[in-house]
Amino acid sequence: KSSNEATNITPKHNMKAFLDELKAENIKKFLYNFTQIPHLAGTEQNFQLAKQIQSQWKEFGLDSVELAHYDVLLSYPNKTHPNYISIINEDGNEIFNTSLFEPPPPGYENVSDIVPPFSAFSPQGMPEGDLVYVNYARTEDFFKLERDMKINCSGKIVIARYGKVFRGNKVKNAQLAGAKGVILYSDPADYFAPGVKSYPDGWNLPGGGVQRGNILNLNGAGDPLTPGYPANEYAYRRGIAEAVGLPSIPVHPIGYYDAQKLLEKMGGSAPPDSSWRGSLKVPYNVGPGFTGNFSTQKVKMHIHSTNEVTRIYNVIGTLRGAVEPDRYVILGGHRDSWVFGGIDPQSGAAVVHEIVRSFGTLKKEGWRPRRTILFASWDAEEFGLLGSTEWAEENSRLLQERGVAYINADSSIEGNYTLRVDCTPLMYSLVHNLTKELKSPDEGFEGKSLYESWTKKSPSPEFSGMPRISKLGSGNDFEVFFQRLGIASGRARYTKNWETNKFSGYPLYHSVYETYELVEKFYDPMFKYHLTVAQVRGGMVFELANSIVLPFDCRDYAVVLRKYADKIYSISMKHPQEMKTYSVSFDSLFSAVKNFTEIASKFSERLQDFDKSNPIVLRMMNDQLMFLERAFIDPLGLPDRPFYRHVIYAPSSHNKYAGESFPGIYDALFDIESKVDPSKAWGEVKRQIYVAAFTVQAAAETLSEVA
């Protein structure tokens, strides 16, 4: 069949009909509906929302909508024994205590079940000791402390400011440094933009606002008790001592009013340089311990949270493909929130809801996509990407054989300045072509394309006249699809101006103040940015599901592979003598990249010329495109990270949110000058070059003529 047999509307009209059906007003209504009460993973409220979405997706016209449940490890504060931090005097008396909850925003004073700020999966404990300020608690911050300043964190409670890297990496670094507790806080330098009022009068973080979040180091494992397998009714669960990624020391988050009280007394070493100073009126002394008059005072943590196996629910909707029903294009985003989820995740969930409604409308008019579209409302993303990972573990055999693409749909906005896209290079041309067809919502770009405003505001650092597209990292539900299964993936949202706004994320991230009103009053009153994001996400899904030839360009992978090879070689070149001593050569990698480039070029030529009316040849060429991302998967995974299997990309070992290229080689080279056995260390570099070169060459060969 040709794809037109599946439809009573011409292909070009299909896309237009789909996009025209998307309405800002609907997204606004859906956002309001999803944000009136908290929807914390594992709660009755979130189960009820799952059933509501299931019902509405059925009404919208999907062929089937099912709930997929799993019993996973979650973490909650103890309702009768709250978490807090104290300053204690020499007699052990608590002379200062941090707040037990965030002051609720106007209109929400009587809402029940607002979970107080906590660090999910913190163990219980009441450590007391001297404080050390560790800046952002990045790898380089601990290098500065330990190597340059000779400050020992062993047996200390460290206080770190949020921002720059994933909080789980901060906790891991603190543990490795020997700390016995971690206090995380939001510094106004990172979460209070100058010239903007704090909520409810603006979008800045008030002093009593606190960022919640999990502090796991799962490395893609999913449920900590069932790594690699679904947490179903007959699952074998590990004991808590063998669980994956749990922190070993108590951790707790606070706002900047409370942080001020802790930091203002700090003594010991002065901050090493201005990059260690935030915006509070405190010296930012590193410590250890308090200054002069307060030197006998200590800090004590009181953490009583519990880990509990709890049922979670994904909603999975199916729109069956008319021509290739066994090829899946997936649009997924999470539903669970820390509190109201005004931005994270419901600004994304509202967009998914409207995309489903638009597809459903076309289906009711007799249209079907060429390929099957799966829609997912994931649960427990905030607790470690659990819902998406468990579902993918359960369905891995289907996904690895049938998965064409995964488009993520968490928060639609983190600002209102310009578009932000992270995706596989296979999708670069799809994104470029789509955004050229969409109208820009930006002021000053009336009548111009989204591509034009995006390129102007966020230019590519490498290619003039093109927009920046970033590498996929992690910290969201695409992780299992891309990093573990090798399914081509992408994400898009509206973002801030990174040049002028240096704060991390958006100020009210994961706080009680992330409300519907935050979005409606301050970020997107007309919901025009939400609509644009719906058009980008929905347009990508539409093209991936409906184009006769998959809209993947393998030549773009060739370009970035050369760039990544150059980058990793440049890092290695900082050790020229060792490269000579241990005969370290990157020639095999560059040779493989050259072969990939030539084969990809020939494949693209064949793609232009083949007979698209021959369904067997069409399917064959499409399968080569679909399986190209899969070819970058190493079944053995990366060292000590078995669920990160993509050889070209992995989440950075120092920041889960960031993507790293050739991560195996990168990690082998990282801090190599400090390794006790240089011969062994450089041997591992050589092994990782070998793995990367082999993988690139093997991937190239999947694009060769089949016989």
Epitope: P461, E462, R562, K563, D566, K567, Y569, S570, M573, P576, F586, D587, F590, S591, K594
Partner: nanobody, 118 residues
Framework: EVQLVESGGGVVQPGRSLRLSCAAS????????MHWVRQAPGKGLEWVAT????????EYVDSVKGRFTVSIDNAKNTLYLQMDSLRAEDTATYYC???????????WGLGTLVTVSS
């Protein structure tokens, strides 16, 4: 043939300046990065500096930061290393290293000797 040729070395007093050049033939500086590496007499190779792409970003070994500046002139297809406030410990043979955008193996120049002595 792809080759890199360094020039500009010589004998100079401590505190003075030198400018090294590295002319490329057979390929253009469209490659990702170009590097300067040095080898002091009787010592191993030491990385000195890297300049990326269009010359917008560069990195230096700690011992030369604030004294050395790497730059590129794409029109002349030449890489430079401006060396100021030279010290005796900067005495070395300086090599430039790069890789043509289509080549598999890196290209090393033959080197130019810099001697810092009073």
């Amino acid at each position: 043939e792809v080759q890199l040729v360094e020039s500009g070395g010589g004998v100079v007093q401590p505190g003075r300046s030198l400018r090294l050049s590295c002319a490329a033939s057979g390929f253009t500086f469209s490659s990702y990065a170009m590097h300067w590496v040095r080898q002091a007499p009787g010592k191993g190779l030491e990385w000195v500096a890297t300049i990326y792409q269009d010359g917008s970003e560069s990195e230096y070994v700690d011992s030369v930061k604030g004294r050395f500046t790497v730059s590129i002139d794409n029109a002349k297809n030449t890489l430079y290393l401006q060396m100021d406030s030279l010290r005796a410990e900067d005495t070395a043979t300086y090599y430039c290293v790069g890789r043509a955008s289509t080549s598999i193996t890196p290209v090393w120049g033959l080197g130019t000797l810099v001697t810092v002595s009073s």
